[in-house]
């Protein structure tokens, strides 16, 4: 079933979540779907501490996260509230830039080479990070 008490093989545990770091690139939608089929979601960054953890593992490489505004407002893929939540945009970002010549603006968020966030064309083949939460029941310390 989907109830998890420990991370799958090749996933990294951190603060009761499990993370998987890709080494290839996909468009945002394909990365999003890849995570779903692993019973996970594209990483949702909720704190500076989580930001630093992810940044440490991905290095200076453009990497998709689970944040997009394809339907208007910015949304995290797991429903975490964007407006009140953690943000780490680069200065002047997001800018929904249309000057790339690829059609449309920029609707998907990624970590840049310095870890701060940028919005970019969702079709770009960037690396990605999947995240899945461990169950609350498994967070309780064992009875002695």
């Amino acid at each position: 079933g989907s109830e998890r008490t420990c991370c799958p093989v090749n996933w990294v545990e951190h603060e009761r979540s499990c993370y998987w770091f890709s080494r290839s690139g996909k468009a945002w939608a394909d990365a999003d779907n890849y995570c779903r089929l692993e019973d996970a979601h594209l990483v949702v960054v909720t704190s500076w501490e989580e930001q630093k953890f992810v940044q440490h593992h991905i290095g200076p490489v453009n990497t998709w996260m689970g944040l997009h505004d394809q339907n208007g407002p910015w949304k995290w893929v797991d429903g975490t509230d964007y407006e009140t939540g953690f943000k780490n945009w680069r200065p002047e970002q997001p800018d929904d830039w249309y000057g790339h010549g690829l059609g449309g603006g920029e609707d998907c968020a990624h970590f840049t080479d310095d870890g701060r966030w940028n919005d970019d064309v969702c079709q770009r083949p960037y690396r990605w990070v999947c995240e899945t939460e461990l169950d609350k029941a498994s967070q309780e310390p064992p009875l002695l």
């Epitope: 989907s2 995570c35 089929l37 019973d39 893929v77 899945t132 169950d135």
Partner: antibody, heavy 121, light 107 residues
Framework: EVQLLESGGGLVQPGGSLRLSCAAS????????MSWVRQAPGKGLEWDSA????????YYADSVKGRFTISRDNSKNTLYLQMNSLRAEDTAVYYC??????????????WGQGTLVTVSS | DIQMTQSPSSLSASVGDRVTITCRAS??????LAWYQQKPGKVPKLLIY???TLQSGVPSRFSGSGSGTDFTLTISSLQPEDVATYYC?????????FGPGTKVDIK
């Protein structure tokens, strides 16, 4: 034992609204995505919508997008389908189905008995 | 969207026969395919997922194979209780589309 019990079906006029409910028991409801799947009389299965375990993300078939809204109340172990602007072609038995994953693998290991929705004037 | 087709739409076979149902996706879906059995007047039951993994409690006479666009459900020795409609379903991405079904009965 996993149990899914749908309710809320009935006769409604075209353009009308209906809210279906699915009461779940026998498993940790919030740990699983859920879907609604319909079956018109004498026809095959048609997936309508899905919602992930924490309720934070939804998926819809094009045929219901903008008309139907899936939601859940994990404190009540209940799944909902709000159906607006109903059409004759929405007439079907509506099943709620339990996904095998939290973030919606998209296939279903338990199904309710279904509730019949009839759209007719 | 990806379309799912099944063949045949119906078949009759004798008890003990080997029965094969095929499912085809209009585009590749890797092995993200499930099979369901729906007996008359009953709710669907999951038989197989990831194309070939048998769901717990499903008799071993059922098996699945295939990848990409072409998939097969096989009943190695048809039993009277296997009279049902069988549906394939793709779940590689939403929408999670079902095939039109194959009705199986006994000669």
């Amino acid at each position: 034992e996993v149990q899914l019990l749908e309710s809320g079906g009935g006769l409604v006029q075209p353009g009308g609204s209906l809210r279906l409910s699915c009461a779940a028991s026998g498993f940790t409801f919030s740990s699983y995505a859920m879907s609604w799947v319909r079956q018109a009389p004498g026809k095959g299965l048609e997936w309508d919508s899905a919602i992930i375990g924490n309720g934070g993300r939804t998926y819809y078939a094009d045929s219901v997008k903008g008309r139907f809204t899936i939601s859940r109340d994990n404190s009540k172990n209940t799944l909902y389908l709000q159906m607006n602007s109903l059409r004759a072609e929405d007439t079907a038995v509506y099943y709620c189905a339990k996904d095998m994953g939290r973030y919606s693998y998209g296939f279903f290991d338990y199904w309710g008995q279904g509730t019949l929705v009839t759209v007719s004037s | 969207d990806i379309q799912m087709t099944q063949s045949p739409s119906s078949l009759s076979a004798s008890v003990g026969d080997r029965v094969t149902i095929t499912c085809r996706a209009s585009q590749g879906i890797s092995n993200y395919l499930a099979w369901y059995q729906q007996k008359p007047g009953k709710v669907p039951k999951l038989l197989i997922y990831v194309a070939s993994t048998l769901q717990s409690g499903v008799p071993s006479r059922f098996s699945g194979s295939g990848s990409g666009t072409d998939f097969t459900l096989t009943i190695s020795s048809l039993q009277p209780e296997d009279v049902a409609t069988y549906y394939c379903q793709k779940y590689n991405s939403a929408p999670f589309t079902f095939g039109p079904g194959t009705k199986v009965d006994i000669k």
